[in-house]
Amino acid sequence: EPPTACREKQYLINSQCCSLCQPGQKLVSDCTEFTETECLPCGESEFLDTWNRETHCHQHKYCDPNLGLRVQQKGTSETDTICTCEEGWHCTSEACESCVLHRSCSPGFGVKQIATGVSDTICEPCPVGFFSNVSSAFEKCHPWTSCETKDLVVQQAGTNKTDVVCGPQDRLR
């Protein structure tokens, strides 16, 4: 009776369990009743990082110097290239696909510490009573306007992204 499931590092094809190709190799032809799975090593600048049945290897990542990237770790037939940023620059994401001089803090966050040559911008959430309505790499959270000191009342409450809106006091006639 043909198998319905295969062991680890095998795959089911034509009612038969074939061996997967090892990392660093791609599938050329499936196994048959009489032959083993045929695999071939990935070419230069290619890789496959899992046991697989892929017919094409993946291209190594290109660390584009025009984006400020350089190679941190050269790829192998089993691993992708790892990029990092030029000295003094910072990756925009975990995958490090591009670089920025320093990151900015989004609305609702203020700059706790301005970036230096060695450390990126440190952002902090604006606490109650403070706001930031801009993306910035230097601006702190600003305190809400004090309506009372202007002899006005709060017409609209502030948030971490917006200032309070002040308005005239209702005068009793």
Partner: nanobody, 116 residues
């Protein structure tokens, strides 16, 4: 395409002054926080000064505070850096850059040399 063109650098004696300009195009200048950054020979990038889009708030590195003034003219799409009381340690290539400060958003820079 973002273009930032710095000018105004040159050779100046210690104690002298220079005014750098940065002409911006390819983006809506008035919407962006702008920075001046410098790189001294053989050193890393140093953040010098920044200005918010409206030109109402500024930042200065401690090393230039009280000597440098950043400003902008949104009608001319131009950023400025007035540098007074220049010192030998201000010698560097000065670049202007815009938020979000990607590697592509840079000009060629302008060289400032302070020497007697």
């Amino acid at each position: 395409e973002v273009q930032l063109l710095e000018s105004g650098g040159g050779l100046v004696q210690p104690g002298g002054s220079l005014r750098l300009s940065c002409a911006a195009s390819g983006f809506t200048f008035r919407d962006y926080e702008m920075w001046w950054v410098r790189q001294a020979p053989g050193k890393g990038l140093e953040r010098v000064s920044a200005i918010n889009p409206q030109g109402t708030r500024t930042y200065y590195a401690d090393s230039v505070k009280g000597r440098f003034t950043i400003s902008r003219d949104n009608s001319k799409n131009t950023l400025y850096l007035q540098m007074n009381s220049l010192r030998a340690e201000d010698t560097a290539v000065y670049y202007c850059t815009k938020l979000p400060f990607t590697f592509e958003d840079w000009g060629q820079g302008t060289l400032v040399t302070v020497s007697s």
